[in-house]
């Protein structure tokens, strides 16, 4: 799988993880930190 | 599947000011940003601006500043965009955009004129 | 803001030519551009995103290409049906589009 940073429109778009582009599905995605789940990482989780 | 529907058509004065909504279906506005873009008749397109409605956050072409809002409404999944002190060249069709995670997918657009 | 700059505004091509559009940024949008094609009373149809990603049901005469700051639109062989207006668009950094190529049969 290809994989590039987001573009930088996408800065703050995942608000507890990291942005990556997944060139061959055409979407960005939040890998969110330990700790956070949701399309954006904004759930926190024990 | 996904939409987004937007708000009728509508004539205004000039001086006036004008809402449009976009109402998204199958999908939550808050894992998205909405985009803004306008078309006057016989010209280019035309981004007017941006919400991240999960943050809350607006950012707006220079030329709008000032004239233009964008709010969202999470409990209800709009977004609107409220164009103020109308004059006859923001008469165009405007149309709301998602993007995010997938590319962008536009709403049908909305025919805003403006005449006296 | 970042400025994009489309040419030619207007081109005539035969049926069966390849016709070629550029867009140059003011600066690197690290391949994030777009390509619409817009027929009149549409609304505008994704040919093409991060340079040269094909939509689903995008006929394989399109293609792009570039990288830094300059971009290229191709249509291999111009079918009857291509004419349109076409708009690149980056989202590198917010949004600019082109002022748009309209491309009309000899």
């Known amino acids: 799988v290809s994989i590039t940073k987001c573009n930088s429109d996408m800065n703050g778009y995942c608000l507890h993880g990291q942005c990556i582009y997944l060139v061959d599905m055409s979407q960005n995605y939040c890998r969110c930190e330990v700790g956070y789940t949701g399309v954006r990482c904004e759930h926190f989780y024990l | 599947q996904d939409q987004l529907v937007q708000s009728g058509a509508e004539v205004k004065n000039p001086g006036a000011s004008v809402k449009v909504s976009c109402k998204a279906s199958?999908?939550?506005?808050?894992?998205?940003?909405i985009q803004w873009v306008r078309q006057a008749p016989g010209q280019g397109l035309e981004w007017m601006g941006r919400i991240d409605p999960l943050r809350r956050q607006t950012k707006y072409r220079e030329k709008f500043e000032g004239r233009v809002t964008i709010t969202a409404d999470t409990s209800t999944n709009t977004a609107y965009m409220e164009l103020s002190s109308l004059r006859s060249e923001d008469t165009a069709v405007y149309y709301c955009v998602r993007s995010g995670r997938e590319f962008d997918f536009w709403g049908q657009g909305t025919l805003v004129t403006v005449s006296s | 803001d970042i400025q994009m700059t489309q040419s030619p505004s207007s081109l005539s091509a035969s049926v069966g030519d390849r016709v070629t559009i550029t867009c140059r940024a003011s600066q690197d949008i690290h391949k994030y551009i777009a390509w619409y094609q817009q027929k009149p009373g549409q609304a505008p149809r994704l040919l093409i995103q991060y340079t040269s990603t094909l939509q689903p049901g995008v006929p394989s005469r399109f293609s792009g290409s570039g990288s830094g700051t300059d971009y290229t639109f191709t249509i291999s062989s111009l079918q009857p049906e291509d004419i349109a207006t076409y708009y690149c668009?980056?989202?590198?950094?917010?949004?600019?589009f082109g002022g748009g190529t309209k491309v009309e049969i000899k």
């Open positions: 668009l980056q989202y590198e950094q917010l949004r600019t």
């Open positions: 199958g999908f939550n506005i808050k894992d998205t940003y």
